[in-house]
């Protein structure tokens, strides 16, 4: 039975030009993360193996930077970076949990960010 | 030991559609890519995609993008390329090769198969 | 796409001699994060697949002997064999696999001379 819960710093803002951390936190569980999928509506992002490491995807490597920890940061973000990103911890025993952040990346200077959520 | 082994050869007419497969053995099939290169007769070597089975996230080349899927099951292990609406440029011998693209080790395509040699003609 | 471009096409070097193969990219193939260049090198035999020899542009894989070596950074590089036995003639190919698509250059024919 998966029993645990991805927390994730949720609906964020951000100012374009900018950079933000897209961080997911999976607790409740004793479950071993093996590795964690960063994905952008399907397309992936960067990879973190247990066992391998990083791999940031070629199509990112000039915008994207692993972490801190499992996190990952954005950076020189466009108006195009605005849209849903995906945490996806593949554990064992438990199973996948998916954790699901929104972002908008502003034009002008306001840029709040949003109350943390929780997915089980 | 890693290997990859790939299905046989291939006589096809122009038009139709090829599935290559690539079988992995001895190493962790969902945390690599698995990549196909094709070579034409005499020719160098041409990148066609890959795929990362642990996500099933594939990336493809523009040249062959309209044509070619790549799949990947995990329960056995196997790599597929289908490449459709062939033609006689389509005749080649196409590799299957184990991607390392992690930012620690990078050992770019490690493993290869055997290759399988796909022939279009009327 | 990144452009790669090999020299010679083929190449005749005496056994023991050195040979020496270039690749130049149109772009620079240097992450800064682990400041790695993300080019490698193959060595193919004919009837046979693609053999990798150095990645990382100067990392040789296990296995292979040290008189392979590579070098360079950026968008310029180079393969050497320091002393060229007979089981070294064969196609080299560089490969760049910093962004999609990947790709190769056309390759240097290497001959005992």
């Known amino acids: 039975m998966m029993t645990g819960t991805i927390e994730t710093t949720g609906n964020i803002s951000a100012e374009k030009g900018g950079s933000i951390i897209l961080q997911c936190h999976l607790s409740s569980t004793t479950a071993q993360v093996t590795q964690v999928n960063w994905e952008q509506q399907d397309q992936l992002l960067a990879i973190c193996n247990a066992d391998l490491g990083w791999h940031i995807s070629p199509s990112f490597k000039d915008r994207v930077a692993p972490g801190p920890g499992l996190g990952l940061t954005l950076q020189s973000l466009t108006v195009n970076d605005t849209g849903e990103y995906f945490c996806i911890y593949h554990t064992y025993p438990d199973g996948t949990y998916t954790g699901r952040i929104f972002l908008e990346v502003l034009e002008s200077s306001v840029a709040e960010h949003g109350a943390r959520f929780q997915i089980p | 030991e890693v290997q990859l082994v790939q299905s046989g050869a291939e006589v096809k007419k122009p038009g139709s559609s090829v599935k290559v497969s690539c079988k992995a053995s001895g190493g962790t099939f969902s945390n690599y890519w698995i990549g196909w290169v094709r070579q034409a007769p005499g020719q160098g070597l041409e990148w066609i995609g890959d795929i990362y089975p642990g996500g099933a996230y594939t990336n493809y080349n523009e040249k062959f993008k309209d044509r070619v899927t790549i799949t990947a099951d995990k329960s056995t292990s196997t790599a597929y390329m289908e490449l459709s609406s062939l033609r006689s440029e389509d005749t080649a011998v196409y590799y299957c090769?184990?991607?390392?693209?992690?930012?620690?080790?990078?050992?770019?395509?490690?493993?290869w198969g055997q290759g399988t040699l796909v022939t279009v003609s009327s | 796409d990144i452009v790669m471009t090999q020299s010679p096409d083929s190449l005749a070097v005496s056994l023991g001699e050195r040979a020496t193969i270039n690749c130049k990219s149109s772009q620079s193939l240097l992450y800064s994060r682990n400041q790695m260049n993300y080019l490698a090198w193959y060595q193919q035999k004919p009837g046979q697949p693609p053999k990798l020899l150095i990645y990382?542009?100067?990392t040789r894989e296990s296995g292979v002997p040290d008189r392979f070596s590579g070098s360079g950074s950026g968008t310029d590089f180079t393969l050497t064999i320091s002393s060229l036995q007979a089981e070294d003639v064969a196609v080299y190919y560089c490969q760049q696999y910093y962004s999609y698509p990947y790709t190769f250059g056309g390759g240097t024919k290497v001959e005992i001379k």
């Open positions: 990382w542009t100067s």
């Open positions: 090769a184990r991607g390392d693209y992690y930012d620690s080790s990078g050992r770019a395509m490690d493993y």
